[in-house]
Amino acid sequence: YDFTNCDFEKIKAAYLSTISKDLITYMSGTKSTEFNNTVSCSNRPHCLTEIQSLTFNPTAGCASLAKEMFAMKTKAALAIWCPGYSETQINATQAMKKRRKRKVTTNKCLEQVSQLQGLWRRFNRPLLKQQ
């Protein structure tokens, strides 16, 4: 999906209002220095691409993020503020339903969510070039 035409400010508002709090809840009890942020993004569409990938794509050691509250709210925000996003996700959602797994918070998941927080931070405050 090409995130270029999303309403970035509306997605930012959704993140600051609710999604960020759910990420904090997920990470509760984890020190901010515990994980090193290695994933970066260059601009807002790229950040959303990386955020979508880390949130919804199962990875080795962390298969369960897509069913977390922050993930559901992320999906809702993208569906509302990114034209045509919902349609691209129908097949992915059906595939996900077939491989429902028990929710387990692993250290790998915590590390992944820490990376997500960095991506969201970057998405919210890209440095603007002064003309």
Epitope: A13, S32, N37, F123
Partner: antibody, heavy 120, light 111 residues
């Protein structure tokens, strides 16, 4: 807890340059915007510019664009601000500041400040 | 650039009384229903300290006698009951539009 420690006070001649450092410890460095703000004696706060250490992207206040260069070294978690062609009006305390965790755009961690005096 | 104008420039209030500082922006700092205006307190020889973020949210460890309100172009910082340690200069800051700008500051003293 995140801390920003800045280099010591500097006395410079007009026309010269100064480079101030700001070392971050106790937290992730590369994914936070790092800013530089200055304060002339008895005056208010003035934003100079910022850097995203993750890729070195910068943004500058037009007022300083031709004279200021902000850089970052991820390996040492250090940000730098270099100001050239110094004049007496550049006498000020220079602060580095880190943006918040969420991208709200406020500064939750500040360096202790570096006093730069420009005098002939 | 967005210009932030604080009023008054200085303010003297009795201990235990209410102190109110205003900040007016030359254009709206709102975006998608959120107000990107922040408030700082600065004491002599120290860096600024965050008090209020996004117009009305209390910063970490800030006493609840501090509060913020407003939206669009008009914002207010209120100290409900002035304490001796509140003597400082207070700044508003907007982040909605680059370049980031600060108000000129309001000096708060005890009457």
């Amino acid at each position: 807890e995140v801390q920003l420690v800045q280099s010591g006070a500097e006395v410079k001649k007009p026309g010269s340059s100064v480079k101030v450092s700001c070392k971050a410890s106790g937290g992730t460095f590369s994914t936070y915007n790092m800013h530089w703000v200055r304060q002339a004696p008895g005056q208010g706060l003035e934003w100079m510019g910022a850097i995203y250490p993750g890729n070195g992207e910068t943004s500058y206040n037009q007022k300083f664009k031709d004279r200021v260069t902000i850089t970052a070294d991820k390996s040492t978690s250090t940000a730098y601000m270099e100001l050239s062609s110094l004049r007496s009006e550049d006498t000020a305390v220079y602060y580095c500041a880190r943006e918040d965790d969420y991208g709200e755009g406020y500064f939750d961690v500040w360096g202790q400040g570096t006093t730069v005096t420009v005098s002939s | 650039d967005i210009v932030l104008t604080q009023s008054p420039d200085s303010l003297a209030v009795s201990l235990g009384e209410r102190a109110t500082i205003n900040c007016r922006a030359s254009e709206s700092v709102d975006n998608s229903g959120l107000s990107f205006m922040h408030w700082y307190q600065q004491k002599p020889g120290q860096p600024p300290k965050l008090l209020i973020y996004r117009a009305s949210n209390l910063g970490s460890g800030v006493p609840d006698r501090f509060s913020g309100s407003g939206s669009g172009t008009d914002f207010t910082l209120t100290i409900s009951s002035l304490q001796a340690e509140d003597v400082a200069v207070y700044y508003c800051q907007q982040i909605n539009t680059d370049p980031l700008t600060f108000g000129q500051g309001t000096k708060l003293e005890i009457k």
